[in-house]
Amino acid sequence: AITEAREEAKPYPLFPGPLPGSLQTDHTSLLSLPHTSGYQPALMFSPTQPGRPYTGNVAIPRVTSAGSKLLPPLAFKHTVGHIILSEHKDVKFNCSISVPNIYQDTTISWWKDGKELLGAHHAITQFYPDDEVTAIIASFSITSVQRSDNGSYICKMKINNEEIVSDPIYIEVQGLPHFTKQPESMNVTRNTAFNLTCQAVGPPEPVNIFWVQNSSRVNEQPEKSPSVLTVPGLTEMAVFSCEAHNDKGLTVSKGVQINIKAIPSPPTEVSIHNSTAHSILISWVPGFDGYSPFRNCSVQVKEVDPLSNGSVMIFNTSASPHMYQIKQLQALANYSIGVSCMNEIGWSAVSPWILASTTEGAPSVAPLNVTVFLNESRDNVDIRWMKPLTKRQAGELVGYRISHVWQSAGISKELLEEVGQNNSRAQISVQVHNATCTVRIAAVTKGGVGPFSDPVKIFIPAHGWVDHAPSSTPAPGNADPVLII
């Protein structure tokens, strides 16, 4: 239950340093004053601290125009020094002073903690004139006080460029404890101690702290604020809050969830974005991180082939982006792919495995036994070769690409021909006489163009000089190609 303290007023303020009490004229001493009109500050001795000069809340008048008598010193009358009240209550306080009628244009201003209060404050000044003096009462009211209204309030009055200052009125707004630091949500390692902090302030002080874990009080005996709770470790998620108690009642902090770090959940939705002959681009959706940031991921690749040895290739990659290009794969092969990710606690299980295939590759070997000879009667060059021994992964042969380069004095021209997969011979027209023709052949599949064969050169003579001897690539292991003319 929240209890309300009785409102009370104390005669003396509760802030550091003693305050002067009522200043009486027999404590004052008149100084020799310069011959100027108006009031001068007087040097006063505080009755609470005899012998210590006190200036600032009285003004002593000079000799009157009649030259016969002194006016009493000007000072604000004493009022209540300390007001204690609860939040949301209304408060009104005032300061009063009697000013001889010979003074005009007296203004009173209110100050809080050294700053003038301007604008929308409820300050009212009332004047009660009499024959010789005018009583001035300055009232200050605050509706529904808040903690921010706490402080030391004073009145200041200016008369003939002199300032008279009242004793302070200290306003203390009391209420339920107010949190300046609350526990915060955390992710912690299982069975590992950690700290939570709670701090609350009044007034009124002291503020005592109780800790609550999953609705059970941790400390039956409270600790004075601030309080640090050492939690000896958790095996499962828990909710913590702290209760702050003072004489006004209690305030409960927000409840914070403390999570236990665990291994992540497996990734989901592994998808294939792009396949080539030797690579596959995949993406995945990360699983729950287990309350601990992902560090990295592992892509696991198994070849799905009864003849393969079933080994798993592992590719480590960063956790973000959730994408990876798997390289160094065989062409036209089937793979099973899974992804696992880790945090500081450990590795997740592997995602559901998905099947993916690489596309056909380009042939890895060139056609064999390339032979070139000149058919002068038709003005052709005949080319023959043997089909290369391509691996299954290279895919189905769709044809050949023939490169023939013609070189004579100062001229070089390369031409490309495509022929179907059923051929193992081709004819090309003679482009230039008295020139060298260099021929290379590559096998072609849907996966691309394979390597070209070693070049075979043949000399094309000027018209009339015939030589039917062919040029050819050597059998494997022989020396460089030879030109036969």
């Epitope: 059970s216 039956e220 005996q221 409270p222 000896p232 828990a238």
Partner: antibody, heavy 118, light 106 residues
Framework: QVQLVQSGSELKKPGASVKVSCKAS????????MSWVRQAPGQGLEWMGW????????TYTDDFKGRFVFSLDTSVSTAYLQISSLKAEDTAVYYC???????????WGQGTLVTVSS | DIQLTQSPGFLSASVGDRVTITCRAS?????MHWYQQKPGKAPKLLIY???NLAQGVPSRFSGSGSGTEFTLTISSLQPEDFATYYC?????????FGQGTKLEIK
């Protein structure tokens, strides 16, 4: 080294009263609660309740409400257990134990045997 | 009130043995504490908050568990370990103790 030193054994007649003391040393007495635990001969441990050493407010478990009173003298860092209208079934060893967060009894007195016999 | 049941109630073992004592709660508790008591002596805190070794307690003692089932394990019994062991729950007032497990030399 934290120490809780209890008063010596007591032999009392039924209907009498007894007051057991527990003097704490080597820590700030008002920082931790003080619990009382009973162990009847050959039996297990029973938590009787505790006293808030800061406020002096006692809390009793249901079985120990009525004849049992916890009190303090913080000036000498001492907790007391008083049992009135003693019965034969109050015969037991009574322990004081320092009471910390999470209901841990981290330091115990050596125990005081109270025997109630006519 | 939460009831704590220790098993076994009596245990006979030899030096060097590994022994486990179980404490079951009638409903879920936050933490379990364990105490050792030798004849004629006060109980001594052994393990607090389920798995934390109290000051000066040898590492052969360990605790684990959560919810309603908790265990105290002594990895290799030493002659000085023969005593009675009690569990005590935190999580629901009043705090309650198990009935005790007496560990004797075989």
């Amino acid at each position: 080294q934290v120490q809780l030193v209890q008063s010596g054994s007591e032999l009392k007649k039924p209907g009498a009263s007894v007051k057991v003391s527990c003097k704490a040393s080597s820590y700030t007495f008002t920082t931790y609660g003080m619990s009382w635990v009973r162990q009847a001969p050959g039996q297990g441990l029973e938590w009787m309740g505790w006293i808030n050493t800061m406020s002096g407010v006692p809390t009793y478990t249901d079985d120990f409400k009525g004849r049992f009173v916890f009190s303090l003298d913080t000036s000498v860092s001492t907790a007391y257990l008083q049992i009135s209208s003693l019965k034969a079934e109050d015969t037991a060893v009574y322990y004081c134990a320092r009471y910390t967060n999470y209901g841990v009894f981290d330091y115990w007195g050596q125990g005081t045997l109270v025997t109630v016999s006519s | 009130d939460i009831q704590l049941t220790q098993s076994p109630g009596f245990l006979s073992a030899s030096v060097g043995d590994r022994v486990t004592i179980t404490c079951r709660a009638s409903s879920s508790v936050g933490y379990m504490h364990w105490y050792q008591q030798k004849p004629g002596k006060a109980p001594k805190l052994l393990i607090y908050a389920t798995s934390n070794l109290a000051q000066g307690v040898p590492s052969r003692f360990s605790g684990s568990g959560s919810g309603t089932e908790f265990t105290l394990t002594i990895s290799s019994l030493q002659p000085e370990d023969f005593a009675t062991y009690y569990c005590q729950q935190w999580g629901s007032l009043p705090f309650t103790f198990g009935q005790g497990t007496k560990l004797e030399i075989k």
